[in-house]
């Protein structure tokens, strides 16, 4: 799913107060719900009928440093007999994150948002065919 | 995929650099990357044979303001036949991503990370049938 | 290991109420859906109903719609199929089923027998 653009009130006060300085922002530290964790059920990766892979990119001026990108094993599924059926289409789900970058000049530290394109996992869809005259 | 702890290191300055006030750091405004757009398929979330629905959960003191939440349509998979077949599972593909929360007293603003589980799609998984004694 | 403990089996007259319940304990966190099965002699079990952990969505096969209602207590891990205005054609050995997504365990079943 796609973020829309930030608009330009998020980052403003109410229109009573004092402008801010055009172009930062004061960003607490700590994460909110920081505990919180997924429950996804183990190997789904493998026992999907669209199954896939995972490669983990690294950066240490990101959080999360660790980014993990799914990617489809198969271009069709995999059946009830476990042959791959070319007649349906294994699909990246792929969603719109944010991650902290950090930036530094000399002992200057900011932080910026950054979306991401993450591809998720797989799913089995069954394609629309065209005859194409 | 989940997000590990937030390291006390990354929004700190190098060692040689004067401390900075604790608790707070400096966010640019913008977001890096903002024009990046997911590409997935047309409706694969109805021709998936793990088909899902979308509800949207609005805020407007979060950065993305919408999140999309999907809820697989069914328990079992949907066969060629169009059918439901419950031998096969519907499972939900969740992802933890970042999103920005906006916090204000009176007319001072300031912004923290929280982390959000958003349930992304569904796919067909066989599952392993044991036998209970 | 996971345990299923199913329980309110028996004989009832057509008409009648039956109340089904089966409890899961050991590893039987994660859970996708819990459920119940049925099989006669001779045939294929078939579903009958099912109800999804994270939001209670329920599914039933269309011949006990309207007559079986089945529910779940999160905290005690327990699933209860509801079964009312009994008929013979009820009558058959029932399944508890929990669902881990990845992985299914059935339970050893309970015998129901409607009789006219």
């Known amino acids: 799913r796609k973020i829309p653009k930030v608009g330009h009130t998020f980052f403003q006060k109410p229109e009573s107060c004092p402008p801010v300085p055009e172009g930062s922002m004061k960003l607490d530290t700590g994460i909110i719900n920081e505990n919180q964790r997924v429950s996804m059920s183990r190997n789904i990766e493998s026992r999907s009928t669209s199954p896939w892979n995972y490669t983990v990119t690294w950066d240490p001026n990101r959080y999360p440093s660790e980014v993990v990108q799914a990617q489809c094993k198969h271009l069709g599924c995999i059946n009830a007999q476990g042959k791959e059926d070319i007649s349906m289409n294994s699909v990246p789900i792929q969603q719109e994150t944010l991650v902290l970058r950090r930036k530094h000049q000399g002992c200057s530290v900011s932080f910026q948002l950054e979306k991401v394109l993450v591809t998720v996992g797989c799913t089995c869809v069954t394609p629309v065919v065209h005859h194409v005259q | 995929r989940k997000i590990p702890k937030v390291g006390h290191t990354f929004f700190q300055k190098p060692e040689s650099c004067p401390p900075v006030p604790e608790g707070s750091m400096k966010l640019d405004t913008g977001i890096i990357n903002e024009n990046q757009r997911v590409s997935m398929s047309r409706n694969i979330e109805s021709r998936s044979t793990s088909p899902w629905n979308y509800t949207v959960t609005w805020d407007p003191n979060r950065y993305p303001s919408e999140v999309v939440q999907a809820q697989c349509k069914h328990l079992g998979c949907i066969n060629a036949q169009g059918k439901e077949d419950i031998s096969m599972n519907s499972v939900p593909i969740q992802q933890e991503t970042l999103v920005l929360r906006r916090k204000h007293q009176g007319c001072s603003v300031s912004f923290q990370l929280e982390k959000v589980l958003v349930t992304v799609g569904c796919t067909c998984v066989t599952p392993v049938v044991h036998h209970v004694q | 290991e996971v345990q299923l403990v199913e329980s309110g089996g028996g004989s009832v007259q057509a008409g009648d109420s039956l109340r089904l319940s089966c409890a899961a304990s050991?590893?039987?966190?994660?859970?996708?859906?819990f459920g119940w099965f049925r099989q006669t002699p001779g045939k294929e079990r078939e579903f009958v109903a099912g109800i999804r952990w994270s939001d209670a969505y329920t599914e039933y096969a269309n011949s006990v719609k309207g007559r079986f209602t089945i529910s779940r207590d999160n905290a005690k891990n327990t699933v209860d199929l509801q079964m009312d205005s009994l008929k013979p054609e009820d009558t058959a050995v029932y399944y508890c089923v929990l669902d881990l997504s990845t992985v299914r365990y059935w339970g050893q079943g309970t015998q129901v027998t409607v009789s006219s």
């Open positions: 050991g590893r039987a966190n994660s859970i996708n859906w």
